[in-house]
Amino acid sequence: DLQEADLDLLRVTLSSKPQALATPNKEEHGKRKKKGKGLGKKRDPCLRKYKDFCIHGECKYVKELRAPSCICHPGYHGERCHGLSL
């Protein structure tokens, strides 16, 4: 049976003080964007404050909750994509 390698798509966590976790061989996140000028151009907190928040996944900042969320890479799950799926 064909299955997506991970079915946990979006895990939202309300923790506002994530520990900085460095995982061996973890994919590097994108370079920090320059500070935008004017209204509505705030820097994405995922690129700085929450840079290492998602262990095996991509960080998305949920403005409404003022919190980071993680979309896990295939095979991983959990609020911070810290666990193997099986």
């Epitope: 064909l2 299955q3 997506e4 390698a5 061996p24 061989n25 996944g57 991509e58 295939p74 193997l84």
Partner: antibody, heavy 116, light 112 residues
Framework: EVQLQQSGPELMKPGASVKMSCKAS????????MNWVKQSHGKSLEWIGR????????SYSQKFKDKATLTVDKSLNTAYMQVNSLTSEDSAVYYC?????????WGQGTTLTVSS | EIVMTQTPLSLSVTIGQPASISCKSS???????????LNWLQQRPGQAPKHLMY???KLVPGIPDRFSGSGSETDFTLKISRVEAEDLGVYYC?????????FGSGTKLEIK
């Protein structure tokens, strides 16, 4: 440096079973699945399955469900694959590999020869 | 399972000339992360496979930048800008979006 050290070559008789090993070092063993891949002589690579080092949970390709059994010993950072009911079709090089979203690391391969 | 169709089966290239290998998947490899988990591996004669590219176009550290990857959804290409003698071997694409993971049939690169 990530290293996957596999056990040596095996010469087995048809109908027998064989168990090969893969010892991992240089990374957190429980953070990544261990995958096993078959390569018959001069052929392409075939994904056999994967094992979760935390709890021994497995996922197999349909083709190898009744042929291979994947296990792990977390305390030894070692994964194992048992190949059952051997036939000449099972003669191949078997690789263990840490395949993940940011690349892969491979063992040197274990050559299995099945001959009467 | 996802079928990975690789072309050509073999390729004979003069040193210094470019080379291109194609890989097509039977289904889109785009995942919910917005990433596409398409990999390229090189297997030199008598050796274990070695990872070259991941997520379509990202070069594994230590791999020379004459290798590049491109494509999206179902169509992918590995390019070598200037082939060198050490590049001979078989090249495989590998999809990691779905289980079971599946490999292409391989492209044998020979030096003219």
């Amino acid at each position: 440096e990530v290293q996957l050290q596999q056990s040596g070559p095996e010469l087995m008789k048809p109908g027998a079973s064989v168990k090969m090993s893969c010892k991992a070092s240089g990374y957190i063993f429980t953070d990544y699945y261990m995958n096993w891949v078959k390569q018959s002589h001069g052929k392409s690579l075939e994904w056999i399955g994967r094992v979760n080092p935390n709890n021994g949970g497995t996922s197999y390709s349909q083709k190898f469900k009744d042929k291979a059994t994947l296990t792990v010993d977390k305390s030894l950072n070692t994964a194992y694959m048992q190949v059952n009911s051997l036939t000449s079709e099972d003669s191949a090089v078997y690789y263990c590999a840490r395949i993940y979203y940011g690349g892969s690391d491979w063992g040197q391969g274990t050559t299995l020869t099945v001959s009467s | 399972e996802i079928v990975m169709t690789q072309t050509p089966l073999s390729l004979s290239v003069t040193i210094g000339q470019p080379a291109s290998i194609s890989c097509k998947s039977s289904q889109s490899l785009l995942y919910t992360t917005g990433k596409t988990y398409l990999n390229w591996l090189q297997q030199r004669p008598g050796q274990a496979p070695k990872h070259l590219m991941y997520q379509v176009s990202k070069l594994v550290p230590g791999i020379p930048d004459r290798f590049s990857g491109s494509g999206s959804e179902t169509d992918f290409t590995l390019k070598i800008s200037r082939v060198e003698a050490e590049d001979l071997g078989v090249y495989y694409c590998l999809q990691g979006t779905y289980y079971p993971h599946t490999f292409g049939s391989g492209t044998k690169l020979e030096i003219k």
